[in-house]
Structure formats: structure tokens, C-alpha cells
């Protein structure tokens, strides 16, 4: 028998630094977790004390926080390098910056191999692209060879920016002619490391022939045996086991997100390379791992470009960005106006004719929005200005929901309406009228949305049997200020760009704004 | 059906350097590793280098580690081995070999070229 | 480094016979065991992999057996084209090493 180690992340998303328990900003460094120099130490002490690892990434990398902001991706080719990692998977956010800004900064400069066998270049793109990423990968390992076949998530024409020349096939129509390929070059443990979300992790297990084991990303998963370390709750056991259609137990595993646990799987294959057994879990990256001292002087040298960027300006505001939450808690506010027409911009994707784009829809929790910003500073604005309007390092998400479950979800807004809660709606491409004199449950008396299968935008009302694209924050799509609803009755969830990037980049593109208070909620007469 | 034609073999003085190419043909080149194995006149076989099918990752016996330098060009289906530094004890057929299975199956070798090392 | 040691240097037999060729290595190998056949002006040629897989083409009077440091090359029956000299060939961390050889002539 022959034993292999895989050490996994998933979805770091830009957490460089350490962070706080819930994976924003370290604040008290003592609590703090992950990053990199902490994920190097536990990295190398599993390297001396086994003889066959690798450490895999499945994508989702790009996009989180203002490393990725200010360097593009330059920064997470030079500390994956650092900690020489064996392969990576493209995920959807790694063409946030279009397919440019993934070849210049990463495909470039990694020394690992870049994986995913269900993208497809064609056009002028094919020969600019060719073999800067690859379908699958075969590593020696100890005195053995692995086979690792990328896959990425086909709804990435949706969620970033891959242009018009990369297809995005079916993951496990795509995967098995390059597993078939690796078992006739007699490679016999093959690896599916990709970005596609748990439930096609298990399927891709399920049905393709030939894969030993998947290591996945996208849907954050947290798997766990036992008593769990931290916060996250676990959705099932690591590794999680299918049974595949040709009867063999095929191990899946994620690592939950944003670096804050490294996977940790060991698998023993037979002389055959069949899977004769296999454990492991997540490993919390808390304060017990020292940070490696000499990436850590690293990430502090990186670290000073940051702090100057966050001072410069991104663009200017002739009006009052009006954040109070005497405003956006209780009525319209030109900030909430603001921060749904950049999610809305920051979503443009022109996928289909029919279609003048795919989402016409935000809203957004008033009491997410912390603080305003005066414009008689200049009108400039600042990223260490919209840090304190967006303070919590979230992102802002894609859903599916049904009619019904947005008009629950507007029925909440006002429920209690008049306390100063957070749960008042804030929204984009979406006109809502309130009668507060009916009782709670019952307040919402018009509700229009935007159409997308239209050449001219208009307002329809909203039908409760239809299925809505809707932008919103993480914090809602997670069922906080209380829109269980969402949670509950999503249909789809795919996690977005970081909140403050999104705002930083539409503000810079617009260069001088002036949003107003133009009437998408109102009251009716008499009732307010 | 495979084939392996080396050249590039010839007398160099010792400390000179020397060139080999390997034409490869019937085969999907950039799937396998391929090796050089080299033969003294009148012994046996002694390996000399390993190029993984993309060139990712090369290996060299102790012999020859910091003189030769194994690549490929997959676009052209050539083999090379760059020999500097060269001895007498360098001497040898140089074979060109295909690895079918991960350094377990070298499984097609090409006819070999003469080096010969010698003031 | 792993050193091959083969035995005998020479083996000689008449047509028909068995040929038993010995192999071991410093240390264990595993499976990763090779034996070549080499006729004198001409490339080597594969016979066994993996210490007991017969090579594509290669007749069933060959088979190789052994694990770890101690392995066999068997000829059945010695046909005249079988008299060569026979290497046996190991890999343990993609570096490889080919025993000194085991002429088989005619006796």
C-alpha cells in the first residue's frame, strides 16, 4: 500500500494577512487566524513529518480584500509560489479582471500548474492562452505518480468576466476523456481538484470513471469528523464518501473558505492505485501555529503599498452620500441608491441576445450601510471612506429566489418598521410601495422589478411563481437580520466580489456621482 | 509505428561541449517521458536523464548532474541533450528511450549515436 | 543510491533449456523492476516491467517474479535468438539504475 497526504484550500479569497474568527480584519492578533506565513508553518511540518504531499488549491483565489484590489493577482502567484504549492484549479473569480488580468499575474508567474479540463479557448484567445493552463497535470510523487484533472464552475460567464472566447463546458462531459487519456498512460490515482460547488463535487464522484478522489471549492463547504474546532457548522463528514456508479468509494472534501482551515487528507491506494482507505479533517489554522517569520516579513513588505492606496482618491461626489441610519434604516437613501447600482454594474454580463442582462435586481439591508460621506471634502472619495461605509468585509452575492420569497423578504423590511433596525431594504431595479397602517406581514401593497428579457428596461409587477436573479450581500443570502426567507428558499447561491471593491471600481469608472433619492420606495398616502 | 532516430554524435575534446537531438515519430510525443541511456564500448547500461512529458520536472544520474542538461521542444517531437564539460569516461552510445509508464516500461529505444570523447 | 548486483555473469545453456537470471537490489525497489534483452550491435530491447508484466510482443516462454530487493527473469525454454546479454533495471525516486548483465551463450 501506498500512503498520499493532500493538503487542500479552497476559496481563500484574498486573506493574505491573519484574520478575526469570522474571517474580516484581525483585530486582536492573539484570536486571529489563517493567512499565509501560519498556513507555511503547518504546511512544512506536515512536508518533514510524511513522505508523500501535495498541496492543492481549488480556486478562488482572486477577489476579497484590498490585497487582491491593489495587486491584482501578482500576489497570489508570489505567496502560492512562496509555499510551493503542487496545483491549483481556476475558479469562476480568477476572470474577475478578465481573462488578461488572469494570464499577466498568475498564469504567467505561477510555478505550479493551473488546472481545468472544461475550459475551452478559441478564437484569437486559443494560441495567447495555450498551455498557460491545462486540462490535467501528472506529478511525481515520492516514487509515484498523481494525476490531478481541473474543473471550474460553467456558470463562470455569469458570475465574472471570461470574455467571449473561453467555453465553459459541462464539468463531467469535459472530465472524462481526460481521465480516459491518464488511465491509458497508465496513471492509476487521479485527483478531480476543481470549482464548481459540493453538489457537483459529489456528482463528478459519482459519475466519472477512473477519479480516486475530489478535492472542491465554491460553495465554502465545511466538512468535519467529530466535534468541530470553531464556528462553522459542518455539512457533512471529511471526507464525505459517494458511492460511485461503478461501485467504488470515492472521498470528496472542501475546506470551508477564506484560509481558515487547511484540508488535510490521507489516502491509501493499493499496487492497483484503487482507494483502500481514507481520513483526515480540516485543520483550524488558529493562534497555536506560529506564523513562518520569514513569509510574515513578507506579507509586512507587501503590506506597506496597501496602506498608501487606501488614501488615494477613487473618484469625486458632487452630493451628500447620505449613509446615516436615520436615513437608510427608515426610508430611500441616496447611499443604498448608490451601492445597488454599482452590484448591479459590477454584474453586467451579456451572455444572451434575448437578454439585455441577466440580473436587473439588488437589495440591501440599510443596517449594513455604517456611515455616510460628506462631500465637502473636495468630493473626494477614498477606500479607507468606503471602509467605513462597508466595514465588514463581506461580498456581494448572485441568487435565485422565487417571487414569493422576495416579496416575504419586503414583507420583513417593514415589519417592525420605525424601531431603527437594520432589516429595512435598501434596493436596485426594484420599485416597492409600503402601506404602513396594515399590519405587519401585510404592508407590502405594490412590488415592480425590472425586466432582463427585454430590449427597453421596464417594471413589471412582480410574479410570485417566477424566478428572480437577485444581487444582494452575503450577510442576507446567510439569512442575517432576520431574512431566514432567503436562506430557507434560495434556489442558488454564488458567492460575489468583495462589497468595497465593488463600489471602489464602479466609483472609479463613473469618476464624479451624483446619485439621488428618485422614488424606488415610497409610502402610501396617508400611512407615513 | 514508434520511432527513434538520434544525432548530433561525433569525437569532441575533452572539456568541449556537445549537442544531441532525438526525432521522435508514431507516437503522441508530448504524452511520455523520455529518457537518454548510454552505453560505454564493450559495458553495460548506464541511465543518464529523465525529461517529464511536458519538461516540468528533469533528473540526471550523479555522473553527469551539473554538465548535462536534458530538454524538448513538443512542438517539434525533438529530444535534446546538451553534454558539457565532457570526459573521456563520457565516452558512450547515447540511446534515446521512450517511457511508457512513468519509469517503470521503457519501452522503445532508438538505434543510438557514438560519442566519443578523446584529445 | 541503490546499487543492482545480477547473477551469474554468464550463464550457459543449451537450446531448450531453462534459464534462471537472478537480480537483487541494495535495497527494496517495490515493484519497479525492468529486464532488457540486448544482442550485441543492437538496442536494447523490453521484456518485463513492473517485475512481472510481459512487454507487448514479447514471448510467453519469459517471465519475471519478485518483490522488495530479490527478483527472477525465467526463460521456459531457450530458443537460438534468446542467447544475449539480459538487464535488469530499477527506478526508486526517479533515479534509475541498470544491474552490470547476465550473458546467456550457447553452451
Known amino acids: 500500500a501506498w500512503e498520499l497526504t493532500i493538503l487542500h484550500t479552497n476559496d481563500v479569497h484574498s486573506r493574505l494577512e491573519q484574520t478575526s474568527e469570522d474571517s474580516s480584519k484581525c483585530v486582536n492578533a492573539s484570536r486571529c487566524m489563517g493567512g499565509v506565513a501560519r498556513l507555511f508553518t503547518k504546511v512544512q511540518q506536515i512536508r518533514r513529518a510524511e513522505p508523500n504531499v501535495l498541496l492543492l488549491d481549488a480556486g478562488d483565489q482572486y477577489q476579497g480584500t484590498i490585497w487582491f484590489t491593489v495587486y491584482k493577482g501578482a500576489e497570489v502567484a508570489h505567496f502560492m509560489n512562496a509555499l510551493r504549492y503542487d496545483a491549483m484549479a481556476l475558479g469562476n473569480h480568477e476572470f474577475d479582471n478578465g481573462v488578461e488580468g488572469l494570464i499577466e499575474p498568475l498564469l504567467k508567474e505561477a510555478k505550479f500548474p493551473i488546472l481545468s479540463a472544461n475550459i475551452k479557448a478559441k478564437g484569437p484567445l486559443a494560441s495567447q492562452i495555450s498551455g498557460l493552463y491545462l486540462p490535467y497535470k501528472v506529478l511525481p510523487v515520492g516514487d509515484e505518480v498523481v494525476g490531478i484533472v481541473g474543473y471550474t464552475s460553467k456558470e463562470t460567464p455569469f458570475l465574472s468576466n471570461p470574455g467571449t472566447n473561453l467555453v465553459f463546458e459541462d464539468e463531467i462531459t469535459a472530465l472524462q476523456p481526460e481521465v480516459d487519456k491518464l488511465k491509458t498512460l497508465n496513471v492509476n490515482k487521479i485527483i478531480a481538484l476543481g470549482h464548481s460547488g459540493f453538489e457537483m463535487d459529489k456528482l463528478i464522484a459519482q459519475k466519472v470513471r477512473g477519479v480516486d478522489v475530489v478535492v472542491g471549492g465554491h460553495s465554502n463547504t465545511f466538512l468535519y469528523t467529530g466535534n468541530p474546532p470553531s464556528k462553522e457548522v459542518p455539512a457533512g463528514k471529511y471526507p464525505f464518501i459517494v458511492t460511485s456508479d461503478d461501485g467504488r468509494k470515492v472521498p470528496v472534501v472542501q475546506a470551508y473558505a477564506f484560509g481558515k482551515y487547511l484540508g488535510y487528507l490521507k489516502i491509501e491506494f493499493d499496487e492497483r492505485g484503487n482507494v483502500i482507505s481514507s481520513h483526515g479533517n480540516p485543520i483550524l489554522l488558529n493562534s497555536s501555529i506560529p506564523e513562518d517569520p520569514s513569509i510574515k516579513a513578507d506579507i509586512n513588505k507587501w503590506r506597506i503599498k496597501l496602506d498608501n492606496y487606501s488614501t488615494q482618491e477613487l473618484g469625486k461626489t458632487i452630493v451628500y452620500l447620505d449613509g446615516s441610519s436615520q436615513s437608510c434604516r427608515f426610508r430611500e437613501c441616496n447611499m443604498g441608491n448608490l451601492i445597488c447600482d454599482a452590484m448591479i454594474n459590477n454584474n453586467l454580463r451579456h451572455t444572451d441576445e434575448m437578454f439585455w442582462n441577466h440580473v436587473s435586481m439588488c437589495i440591501l439591508n440599510g443596517g449594513g450601510i455604517r456611515s455616510p460621506i460628506d462631500e465637502r471634502n473636495n468630493g473626494t472619495i477614498t477606500w479607507e471612506n468606503l471602509a467605513a461605509v462597508l466595514p465588514f468585509g463581506g461580498t456581494f452575492d448572485l441568487v435565485q429566489l422565487k417571487g414569493s420569497t422576495l416579496k416575504k423578504a419586503f414583507e420583513h423590511s417593514v415589519h417592525r418598521y420605525g424601531q431603527s433596525t437594520g432589516e429595512f431594504l435598501q434596493v436596485g431595479g426594484i420599485h416597492v410601495v409600503y402601506d404602513l397602517s396594515r399590519k405587519p406581514g401585510d404592508r407590502v401593497v405594490k412590488l415592480d422589478v425590472l425586466c432582463t428579457k427585454c430590449r427597453v428596461p421596464s417594471y413589471d409587477p412582480l410574479k410570485m411563481d417566477e424566478v428572480y436573479k437577485v444581487i444582494l450581500p452575503n450577510f442576507l443570502a446567510n439569512g442575517g437580520d432576520g431574512f431566514q426567507m432567503i436562506k430557507d428558499e434560495l434556489l442558488r447561491h454564488d458567492s460575489g466580489d468583495q462589497d468595497i471593491n465593488v463600489v471602489s471600481t464602479y466609483i472609479s469608472k463613473m469618476k464624479v456621482i451624483y446619485p439621488a433619492v428618485e422614488g424606488r420606495i415610497k409610502f402610501s398616502t396617508g400611512s407615513h | 509505428q514508434v520511432q527513434l532516430v538520434e544525432s548530433g554524435g561525433g569525437v569532441a575534446q575533452p572539456g568541449r561541449s556537445l549537442s544531441l537531438s532525438c526525432a521522435a515519430s508514431?507516437?503522441?510525443?508530448?504524452?511520455?517521458?523520455m529518457h537518454w541511456v548510454r552505453q560505454a564500448p564493450g559495458k553495460g547500461l548506464e541511465w543518464v536523464a529523465l525529461i517529464w512529458y511536458d519538461a516540468s520536472f528533469e533528473y540526471y544520474a550523479d555522473s553527469v548532474k551539473g554538465r548535462f542538461s536534458i530538454s524538448r521542444d513538443n512542438s517539434k517531437n525533438t529530444l535534446y541533450l546538451q553534454m558539457n564539460s565532457l570526459r573521456a569516461e563520457d565516452t558512450a552510445v547515447y540511446y534515446c528511450?521512450?517511457?511508457?509508464?512513468?519509469?517503470?516500461?521503457?519501452?522503445?529505444w532508438g538505434q543510438g549515436t557514438l560519442v566519443t570523447v578523446s584529445s | 543510491k541503490i546499487v543492482m548486483t545480477q547473477s551469474p555473469a554468464t550463464l550457459s545453456l543449451s537450446p531448450g533449456e531453462r534459464a534462471t537470471l537472478s537480480c537483487r537490489a541494495s535495497?527494496?525497489?517495490?515493484?519497479?523492476l525492468a529486464w532488457y534483452q540486448q544482442k550485441p550491435g543492437q538496442a536494447p530491447r523490453l521484456l518485463i516491467y513492473?517485475?512481472?508484466n510481459r512487454a507487448t510482443g514479447i514471448p510467453a516462454r519469459f517471465s519475471g517474479s519478485g518483490s522488495g530487493t530479490d527478483f527472477t527473469l525465467t526463460i521456459s525454454s531457450l530458443e537460438p535468438e534468446d542467447f544475449a546479454v539480459y538487464y535488469c533495471q530499477q527506478r526508486s525516486n526517479w533515479i534509475f539504475t541498470f544491474g552490470p548483465g547476465t550473458k546467456v551463450d550457447i553452451k
Open positions: 535495497q527494496s525497489v517495490s515493484r519497479y
Open positions: 508514431g507516437f503522441t510525443f508530448s504524452d511520455y517521458g
Open positions: 528511450v521512450r517511457d511508457a509508464q512513468w519509469g517503470s516500461r521503457l519501452d522503445y
Open positions: 513492473d517485475a512481472s
